[in-house]
Every structure is written in structure tokens, then in C-alpha cells.
């Protein structure tokens, strides 16, 4: 082994790069001493380097650290934080559109109904966002609210319009009725089922989001123990007290260092691929009732389909609720309130085509091909760390800790290390409490994840009842079927397409309207997006 | 120390209501998720319901579906438990237990329902 | 929902015995899987996680092992605070199932 190489007689070299991490030259010696007082770069012989040096150089240490581990997530954050805002503007487009949808059905077909429609639907919606960003609302609470308060409204305007004014205080007993005899059908069930189960997913979608943004912020801003600081001073500094001002760490050498560093954070590795790999599932199983795009952009449809069930039953129902409510029937139901062959104007929306369309459900699977890229990201974390700070190739001529070597030898540097500290030690201590917060909640999100994915081979939940209507009964081909009364049926296209300008914004007025198309398809319908010509029928 | 101790049982009535508190102490308890256990008279143990560390994403055991509503104070490191509409099948020991791996639980408080 | 079915429901064993419990779930839980000892009038305690790790401060002779969904806890040597009930307990996915347990008797 050669002997190393005579330390600068004046501790020169030394001097001038310390003074770049430390204005000021008291703490550095004119000429090598004996260095009895060290504790991290034990001296061989003389040495350019006092206990004061050595603090500071540890602290430097560990800022570099906690930089290049910054440095190394930068990319994997910036993702997250961008697809965690792009998917929420995203979703509170599509409640926005949904809720202009179902307003302009109600202009369109029961005029008489606004202004107190807008309202209820107002809220509904205010409560779907809310939901969607992790307020504790109950979804069946939300639909059962919007179910309540319809329906005093349709029974005296629509079902019984004469009423005279002394009658109208019958609401509360309107909103009960309205439970009690199903004046509905089964369409509130319905859009329970699949309001709640498309956005329990797009809920736990963004949180599972918000929670990798909290995964790396957490690990960014972990503060390194004093053990790692030592090891990393040896590493990176020790070889400057005795004049190697140019020599390089051995390669394996960094990787031992930067794992013993490192124990706690790749801890997480198992948890962060289980993450990715949940998320994964999640994201494979948003579609049909799963996918709130699709659910809340027919609503309009589905919520049309119910008024139209209570005016076919409204003779039954107004003589049922005369005797319950105890209020004079002033006027027969009439039959042509029904809106059956309302026709509307036509109504194309002209909207800048884009050549490129993008679904959300493609930029969905656009992320999770992209987080897929970083699944190895903590347990790679130790070698990235050292490919990207000064380390000598191929373990030749390099710093081992202790002296300048020609080979690196794992063995000699850890029985080197041991006089110092026993890396098992640091390794068996555990991570930080932080560290084991943060796994907490990737093991929670992941059940989460995992409870809302929807395992292999399980066919969509039936919710069959005496009306015979299906939730999520559609063939694999075909897009989820909406509504469901049997006559009117509409196929939703899943059609929202991103754009740059995705805060383009609907008005009622804009709303799709009732064109009539000239194609076989002409039941189908295309949801709004912010691309392309439109045409949708609302009837 | 890492502690949870869980107070509120009782002797109820069926048809009747109870509300349970664990309070935590030693660790950060906005960090956990945390659930609720039960274990009848010389049965099993039967989880009850879980909640989120920010109280968002709630869980519920078909058995008590409809009828129990688990909630959390961060701000007073308190888990709850609210029981409602209780019958005789709801008799139990009722635990708190920490994280998604519920690896520290409380002594337990019982409840007992009864006419 | 996922099942869990633990064997023996009870067994007999002496001091110093080796002793195997077995777990089976229902479907795939790849080793989200965890054991509990429990006491008479005491709250369960967590001895293994994720199939095969030891909780800090378990003693060593308590060992798990499985993947999928068979699952095995082995006590390498019992020792007379070891008699208890065992229950295995699945965390993979809501809701939360445990087994019925195995009660380890003084023979």
C-alpha cells in the first residue's frame, strides 16, 4: 500500500478551501499538528485540521446531503404536485359542466321548476366538489337532499299547479312523502350507487395524490443524524487534513456510507411500490360507475328519467298525497304538462378543435406510467446519491475513509468505520418517528387503495330492485349505461378531453340542447368537452 | 410511552346510545390512522371501524353499518365512538388500536346492552 | 369481504415444545398479514407484521412465515408466558378480518 502522500507543510491548500465554507481563518492551523483533539478524521500523522474544522465540516455535510436527496426528488415531486392540481381543476370542470348539464335540462324541459332547481342542483354539486376534496359529507345524505327538495317543487308546479297559495305549506310533509311512497322510483337509489362509488374513487384518487406529495416533502426534509454527518464528513472531508485536496471517494465506499445514511428512508421503499402498484389498480378500475366523469356528466339524463317517472304515476300519486297531506286538489293532473314531444331548439356548441385530445382517463393512465418510472425510487435512492456527487470510478486511486487507496476493500473500510461508530448500529436503530408517520399513512392509503380497486374477475355490483333497473349492468363493450327507465335510455360517451385552458368555462346558455341527429345513433349522446363540435340531445 | 385509554363503556339499554373516547398520548396522533376492535364475552376479535389520519376516509364493519359513527379531535389527540340504536349482540370488550398497523392497543372498555 | 381461517382451534403443548399455528385467507393478500397474542382480561398484543417481521421487543423464538395466503406463526420454543390465544388478522384491505383464533394449553 503506498504510504501517503507528505501533508502540505503550511496546511496552505487547506486554509484556502476552508475558507470557502468558513470566512475566516482562526480555526485552521498554520502548519500540521498533532490533531489528538479530533473525533471524526482520526489523523495517521500530523494534520491540517482542528475539532473546530471538523464541526463545520460536518455540518456542511449534512446540508450537502439533504440537498443532493432534494436534488434527487426534484423530478418525481414536480409530477405529483402537477398532476395532483391538473386532476383536481380537472374533476371541479366536470362537476361544473355536470351541474350546468343538469340546469339546462331544467330550462329546457321544466321552465316552470327554475328558479328553485338551479338551487338544489347548485348544492348538490357544491357538496359533490366538496366531497371530492375530503369534506365528511355522506353521499346519500347529498342525493337525498336534492330528491327531498325537487320534489315539493315538481308536485306544485308541474303535478298540481292550481294549488292555491294557503296550500303551499305542505312541504314537509311533500319531503317525507316523497320517501315513503317512492314517488321516484328507484332513480335515487340509482344515482346513489353510482354517485357515491365514482367518487369515493376520484376522492381517494387525489388523496392517494396529495399523500406522494406529503411522501417526498417528508423525506426532502429529514435531518440527517449525527452518526450520518460523521460518516459523510469521512467520506467527503477527512481526506482534506491530510493535503488531498483533489482525491475522490471510492465508489462502493459512498454506497455503504449513503445506505447506513439512508436506513431509515429505504424503508419506505416497500410501502412507496405498494403504493404506485394500488394506485395502478385504482386507476385500471375507473370506468363505468367507477369513473365520475362518466357518472356525474349523464346525471342530468338519470335525473330527467325520475321526473319523467313521476308524472307517468302522477295521477296515482296526487290523489295519494291529497288524502296525506290534507290539502284540497284544485286541479286534475294534466296530462299535457308531460313534456314527452317537447322539442327544443337545436343547439351546437362551436368550440377550437384541437388536433390533440387527451381523456382523463388517458392522462390517468399517462401518470401512473410515469410514477411506474420511480417505483425503485427509494431503494435506489443510496446509489443515485452517489452517481451524482464526485465519487472516483471504477474504485482506483480513491478515498476509503481513512487513506488514499488503490483498490477499494469493503472489509478494510468497515473494520476502519468500526473504530468510529458500528454501522449495524445505525441500521438497527429504526427510522425517524417522521419516517415511520409517513409509512403509517402509505399503509393506510394503500388499504384504502386496495378496498377501492376492484379485484379481477368481479363483475360491476347489481343493484336489481323491483323496477328491474341495473347499476353498472352494461356489456364490456359499451360505455356505462346511464339511467335506465327503459324508454330513453342514454349512452354516455367518457369524452371530457384535456386542454391547456382547462378552466374553459360552460354557462347555462352554452348548455347542450335537444339537436336531433341525423344517424342511427341518434339516442347517443357526447358528454361536453372542450374540444370539438357537439351535439347532445337533452329530452 | 405510547398509551391509549379508553373510557365511556357501560351498562345500556337496547334501542339505547353510548359514546366511547380513547385518548392517545406519547406519539403524534394526527399521523394515525386509527380503528376500533371489539371482542364479545369469550368470542373472537372482530374489527369495528377504522378513520383516517385527517379524519377524512371512514370504515365500517357491516355488523355496526348505519349505526356507529367513528370520529377523531386531533386537536385533543381523541378518537370516538358513537354507538347508536345498541343490541344485545353489541355487548363487548371495545379496543382503540393505532395505525394501519395496529400495533399498540388500549385496555379496552366495556360495554354491555342489556334489557 | 376476505376470510380468515386459523388451525387449530386449540392445541395442548409443554415447555420448550415447538409449536405451529396456521392462517388461510380467502383470496391473495400477498403478506399483509398479521399475528396477535392474546391474554385472559388484556388487550392483544402484535407480535409479527407483514407476514414475517418481528414487532420490537417480541422475543425471537416467535417466528412468521407465508405469502398469498397460507401463513404460519411458529413458537420455537414455548416458554410458560407463551400460553394465550393467537389470532392471525389480515390489514390488506377493508374491512379488516381476523381468524378465529388458537388457544396454546398447558398439555
Known amino acids: 500500500q503506498p504510504p501517503p502522500p507528505p501533508p502540505d507543510a503550511t496546511c496552505h491548500q487547506v486554509r484556502s478551501f476552508f475558507q470557502r465554507l468558513q470566512p475566516g481563518l482562526k480555526w485552521v492551523p498554520e502548519t500540521p499538528v498533532p490533531g489528538s483533539d479530533l473525533q471524526v478524521c482520526l489523523p495517521k500523522g500530523p494534520t491540517c485540521c482542528s475539532r473546530k474544522m471538523e464541526e463545520k465540516y460536518q455540518l456542511t455535510a449534512r446540508l450537502n446531503m439533504e440537498q443532493l436527496l432534494q436534488s434527487a426528488s426534484m423530478e418525481l415531486k414536480f409530477l405529483i404536485i402537477q398532476n395532483a392540481a391538473v386532476f383536481q381543476e380537472a374533476f371541479e370542470i366536470v362537476v361544473r359542466h355536470a351541474k350546468n348539464y343538469t340546469n339546462a335540462m331544467f330550462k329546457n324541459n321544466y321552465p316552470s321548476l327554475t328558479p328553485q332547481a338551479f338551487e338544489f342542483v347548485g348544492e348538490f354539486f357544491t357538496d359533490v366538489s366538496l366531497y371530492i376534496l375530503g369534506s365528511d359529507i355522506n353521499v346519500d345524505d347529498m342525493v337525498n337532499e336534492l330528491f327531498d327538495s325537487l320534489f315539493p317543487v315538481i308536485y306544485t308546479q308541474l303535478m298540481n299547479p292550481g294549488l292555491p297559495d294557503s296550500a303551499l305549506d305542505i312541504n314537509e310533509c311533500l319531503r317525507g312523502a316523497r320517501r315513503d311512497l317512492k314517488v321516484f322510483g328507484n332513480f335515487p337509489k340509482l344515482i346513489m350507487t353510482q354517485v357515491s362509488k365514482s367518487l369515493q374513487v376520484t376522492r381517494i384518487f387525489l388523496q392517494a395524490l396529495n399523500l406522494g406529495i406529503e411522501v417526498i416533502n417528508t423525506t426532502d426534509h429529514l435531518k440527517f443524524s449525527k452518526d450520518c454527518g460523521r460518516m459523510l464528513t469521512r467520506m467527503w472531508y477527512c481526506s482534506y487534513c491530510q493535503g488531498l485536496m483533489m482525491v475522490k471517494p471510492c465508489g462502493g465506499y459512498c454506497n455503504v456510507v449513503m445506505q447506513g445514511c439512508m436506513a431509515g428512508v429505504v424503508e419506505i421503499d416497500k410501502y412507496w411500490r405498494e403504493y404506485i402498484l394500488s394506485l395502478e389498480e385504482l386507476v385500471n378500475g375507473m370506468y363505468r360507475i367507477y369513473d365520475m366523469e362518466n357518472v356525474l356528466l349523464g346525471l342530468f339524463s338519470t335525473i330527467h328519467d325520475s321526473i319523467q317517472y313521476v308524472q307517468k304515476n302522477a295521477g296515482k300519486l296526487t290523489t295519494t298525497i291529497g288524502k296525506l297531506c290534507a290539502h284540497s286538489q284544485q286541479r286534475q293532473y294534466r296530462s299535457a304538462y308531460y313534456p314527452e314531444d317537447l322539442f327544443i331548439d337545436k343547439k351546437v356548441l362551436k368550440v377550437a378543435h384541437v388536433e390533440h385530445e387527451e381523456t382523463l382517463s388517458s392522462r390517468r393512465r399517462e401518470l401512473i406510467q410515469k410514477l411506474k418510472s420511480f417505483i425503485s425510487f427509494y431503494s435506489a435512492l443510496p446509489g443515485y446519491i452517489c452517481s451524482h456527487s464526485p465519487v472516483a470510478e471504477n474504485d482506483t486511486l480513491c478515498w476509503n475513509g481513512q487513506e488514499l487507496v488503490e483498490r477499494y476493500s469493503q472489509k478494510a473500510a468497515r473494520n476502519g468505520m468500526k473504530n468510529q461508530f458500528n454501522l449495524h448500529e445505525l441500521k438497527m436503530k429504526g427510522p425517524e418517528p417522521v419516517v415511520s408517520q409517513i409509512i403509517d399513512k402509505l399503509k393506510h392509503i394503500n388499504q384504502l387503495l386496495r378496498t377501492m380497486s376492484m379485484p379481477k374477475g368481479r363483475v360491476l355490483d347489481k343493484n336489481l330492485d323491483e323496477e328491474g333497473f341495473e347499476s353498472g349492468d352494461c356489456g364490456d363493450d359499451e360505455d356505462e349505461c346511464i339511467g335506465g327507465s327503459g324508454d330513453g335510455m342514454i349512452k354516455v360517451k367518457n369524452q371530457l378531453r384535456f386542454l391547456a385552458e382547462l378552466a374553459y368555462d360552460l354557462d347555462v346558455d352554452d348548455a347542450p340542447g335537444n339537436s336531433q341527429q341525423a344517424t342511427p345513433k341518434d339516442n347517443e349522446i357526447s358528454t361536453f368537452h372542450n374540444l370539438g363540435n357537439v351535439h347532445s340531445p337533452l329530452k | 410511552e405510547v398509551q391509549l385509554v379508553e373510557t365511556g363503556g357501560g351498562v345500556v339499554q337496547p334501542g339505547r346510545s353510548l359514546r366511547l373516547s380513547c385518548a392517545a398520548s406519547?406519539?403524534?396522533?394526527?399521523?394515525?390512522?386509527m380503528h376500533w376492535v371489539r371482542q364479545a364475552p369469550g368470542k373472537g376479535l372482530e374489527w369495528v371501524a377504522v378513520?383516517?389520519?385527517?379524519?377524512?376516509?371512514?370504515y365500517y364493519a357491516d355488523s355496526v353499518k348505519g349505526r356507529f359513527t367513528i370520529s377523531r379531535d386531533n386537536s385533543k389527540n381523541t378518537l370516538y365512538l358513537q354507538m347508536n340504536s345498541l343490541r344485545a349482540e353489541d355487548t363487548a370488550v371495545y379496543y382503540c388500536?393505532?395505525?394501519?398497523?395496529?400495533?399498540?392497543w388500549g385496555q379496552g372498555t366495556t360495554v354491555t346492552v342489556s334489557s | 369481504d376476505i376470510q380468515m381461517t386459523q388451525s387449530p382451534s386449540s392445541l395442548s403443548a409443554s415447555v420448550g415444545d415447538r409449536v405451529t399455528i396456521t392462517c388461510r385467507a380467502s383470496?391473495?393478500?400477498?403478506?399483509?398479514l398479521a399475528w396477535y397474542q392474546q391474554k385472559p382480561g388484556k388487550a392483544p398484543k402484535l407480535l409479527i407484521y407483514?407476514?414475517?417481521n418481528l414487532q420490537s421487543g417480541v422475543p425471537s423464538r416467535f417466528s412468521g412465515s407465508g405469502s398469498g395466503t397460507d401463513f404460519t406463526l411458529t413458537i420455537s420454543s414455548l416458554q410458560p408466558e407463551d400460553f394465550a390465544t393467537y389470532y392471525c388478522q389480515q390489514h390488506d384491505s377493508y374491512p379488516l378480518t381476523f381468524g378465529q383464533g388458537t388457544k396454546v394449553e398447558i398439555k
Open positions: 406519547g406519539f403524534t396522533f394526527s399521523s394515525y390512522a
Open positions: 383470496q391473495s393478500i400477498e403478506d399483509d
Open positions: 388500536a393505532r395505525g394501519a398497523g395496529m400495533d399498540v
Open positions: 407483514e407476514a414475517s
Open positions: 378513520i383516517s389520519y385527517d379524519g377524512s376516509n371512514k
